[in-house]
């Protein structure tokens, strides 16, 4: 067990803070909730503290919760490939470019680390080149989320990892808005981290609303499990 992994044996409180600017529309989001890495489970609620969110909530899911991939459930035979937990408590910087097909792009930078006993994800997001009447600024996305796989490779040069994946957002007219994600994670501390073999995270997310909440908000339930590396031969013959 890596030293960081020991921090995830129980339920951990999570705080998410995002400051965003998309085509000059500035906004802030606060999110709170909890994660349980034993089950790869995340339960979070987000509110826009600046009024109405200028972009659809589903476009921010990867920035919020795929940001805290340290809550992914890594099966026993894959624990030596869990970069995310091994970087804790000092944490990691996560940078992404998210390119929306035939529309603009988000660039995000996040610091994910423990502050006391709380796992904090602080994010800055800049969005440019979006069409005012497009699927994103025109709020044409359905309020739901598809299952996805996040493909992870080691980045030995930077002592971190890279990830590439494509998100499929459902549009109200029945079509799909694609969002290409290019992700890089580097540790904040200088302690040893686990550099993984190629594998993927299987992610299932459910979006809902709080019937008592008057503010613009999103409730998120997510399950994430690592896969893609089989038991070694020594495991098979045990």
């Amino acid at each position: 067990m890596s030293k960081g992994e020991e921090l995830f044996t129980g339920v951990v409180p999570i705080l998410v803070e995002l400051d965003g600017d998309v085509n000059g529309h500035k906004f802030s989001v606060s999110g709170e909730g909890e994660g349980d890495a034993t089950y790869g489970k995340l339960t979070l609620k987000f509110i826009c503290t600046t009024g109405k969110l200028p972009v659809p909530w589903p476009t921010l899911v990867t920035t919020f919760s795929y940001g805290v991939q340290c809550f992914s459930r890594y099966p026993d035979h894959m624990k030596q490939h869990d970069f995310f937990k091994s970087a804790m408590p000092e944490g990691y910087v996560q940078e992404r470019t998210i390119s929306f097909k035939d529309d603009g792009n988000y660039k995000t930078r996040a610091e994910v680390k423990f502050e006391g006993d709380t796992l904090v994800n602080r994010i800055e997001l800049k969005g440019i080149d979006f069409k005012e009447d497009g699927n994103i600024l025109g709020h044409k996305l359905e309020y739901n989320y598809n299952s996805h796989n996040v493909y992870i490779t080691a980045d030995k040069q930077k002592n971190g990892i890279k990830a590439n994946f494509k998100i499929r957002h459902n549009i109200e007219d029945g079509s799909v808005q694609l969002a290409d994600h290019y992700q890089q994670n580097t540790p904040i501390g200088d302690g040893p981290v686990l550099l993984p073999d190629n594998h993927y995270l299987s992610t299932q997310s459910a979006l809902s609303k709080d019937p008592n909440e008057k503010r613009d908000h999103m409730v998120l339930l997510e399950f994430v499990t690592a896969a893609g590396i089989t038991h070694g031969m020594d495991e098979l013959y045990k």
Epitope: P13, I14, G31, G33, E34
Partner: nanobody
Framework: QVQLQESGGGSVQAGGSLRLSCVAS????????MYWYRQAPGKACELVSL???????TYADSVKGRFTISRDDAKNTVYLQMNSLEPEDTAVYYC?????????????????QGQGTQVTVSS
């Protein structure tokens, strides 16, 4: 779904006492910082008290020595014992759960908060 349900409000004479309760569901109560704040008509909302998971408490100067916050993690409940009540304590009282233990903080920014319970103190 996370729910916070306050109870125990009512009308009392100045100098009287009330005990507010807030039951939480849908969250792992023991890991959250629990707050009470209040909103009087036409006034800015005011943080009243905070209790963190280890039991450490913080109070607004206006209620120090009169109000006591406590928690029972087995019952997923936070309490506010209010003694020596004054007309200035009249407000709607809300409980809130947070993963951040900031004091002070804006009470409009709580992600998880209840619907409130009315406390009226008459002279």
């Amino acid at each position: 779904q996370v729910q916070l349900q306050e109870s125990g409000g009512g009308s009392v004479q100045a100098g009287g006492s009330l005990r507010l309760s807030c039951v939480a569901s849908g969250l792992t109560f023991s890991i959250y910082r629990m707050y009470w704040y209040r909103q009087a008509p036409g006034k800015a909302c005011e943080l009243v008290s905070l209790i963190i998971p280890d039991g450490t408490t913080t109070y607004a100067d206006s209620v120090k020595g009169r109000f006591t916050i406590s928690r029972d993690d087995a019952k997923n409940t936070v309490y506010l014992q209010m003694n020596s009540l004054e007309p200035e304590d009249t407000a709607v009282y809300y409980c809130a759960a947070s993963t951040a233990g900031n004091w002070p903080r804006a009470c409009t920014d709580f992600v998880y908060q209840g619907q409130g319970t009315q406390v009226t103190v008459s002279s």
